[in-house]
Amino acid sequence: IPKVPPGPNITATYGDKWLDAKSTWYGKPTGAGPKDNGGACGYKDVDKPPFSGMTGCGNTPIFKSGRGCGSCFEIKCTKPEACSGEPVVVHITDDNEEPIAPYHFDLSGHAFGAMAKKGDEQKLRSAGELELQFRRVKCKYPEGTKVTFHVEKGSNPNYLALLVKYVNGDGDVVAVDIKEKGKDKWIELKESWGAIWRIDTPDKLTGPFTVRYTTEGGTKTEAEDVIPEGWKADTSYESK
């Protein structure tokens, strides 16, 4: 049972006023949070581009049982004095399981330090916990970043598990469907855990597939034939 009741869910609305939250940090002081550079969303290597360690755990209204994975937030702090007051963008990659406020970001050491004045990163981290302001923003990944579909380990012609990542705009995914080449019917994948979607089917899935993903704001995007014929498990495929 959370010590503090969560705030209302943060939805895909933008340009809103700043909201108050508490912030802490975990992991290595200049690291990306989890020891294994992962997190509850299922993303790996969050220390590397495009997340580049600007990552964090959100509590229930932010993580939303995995639905918040990939969403982006501007965060800033004004106190203590080491705070720059300038907003930085963080990506939700993990679940904050022990919230201390209705909205609580448990940030990577790197992201926490990024709110500091230049040279004061360690000073800010030594505060440990602080008040911050946040608002949902559209995700803008570095140019050349492609939406990536990771076919999870164990996937086979009767079972396909997909992790969708690096989605511009809303960032988070609320529905995933696939369509086999030459067929008209979309097959709906079911949400599993983290940001992984899956389908179990008695009919063999051979590929190539077009993947359609829907973000929280309702935008549907199709990645045509992104998963090729002869696709392999534990392999990532980039949209064209």
Epitope: K44, S65, A161, W193, G194, I196
Partner: antibody, heavy 116, light 107 residues
Amino acid sequence: ESGGGWVQPGRSLRLSCSASGLTFDDYAMHWVRQAPGKGLEWVSGISWNSGVRAYADSVKGRFTISRDNGKNSLYLQMNSLRPEDTALYYCAKDIRAATPYALDHWGQGVLVTVSS
Amino acid sequence: ELVMTQSPSSLSASEGDRVTITCRASRTIYNYLNWYQQKPGRAPKLLIHAASTLQDGVPSRFSGSGSGTEFTLTISGLQSEDFATYYCQQSHGTPLTFGGGTTVDVK
């Protein structure tokens, strides 16, 4: 499984589960508990590569699941233990690697008793 | 969280009887439903996964059916070794949840 025993409320325990006879990193793993005379309660699960970890609401923020594929081992770090955590704790192997599906192999269970 | 409701909670039967146990999900779980058998002092054993697929080595007198929210485990021709407690469990989403169990004992 190992690491069980009697502990006072508020204290910590770490459970371990060592697997043999299977390719450990091909499967998701779970902890399931059973209070004396009661039914089964899923506690936590972890995907093959630790990419996803999930918890029951009753243990969220207190328990941490982890695995070491090199040692074929699964762990459950239990902090801030409560009397209601008293149970037989089973480690269980999933049929799948990346998503939860069905638990086809179970350990013999390890007893955790929390009381003052 | 998804609530799994099992009925009955207990039943008495004789060898050779046909036994039916029902499991209801609070919302659709498609066919992500498993059945386990547990005997006193033993770990649970997987009988059926994906609502109707018999696990290797499980006798064919066990069968499962249903999809969506309503599921059934049937034992056709109860044997002495089948007196045990049976649990359903959904794996559609986390937290994974079990039904409360059905104990099958000797009439």
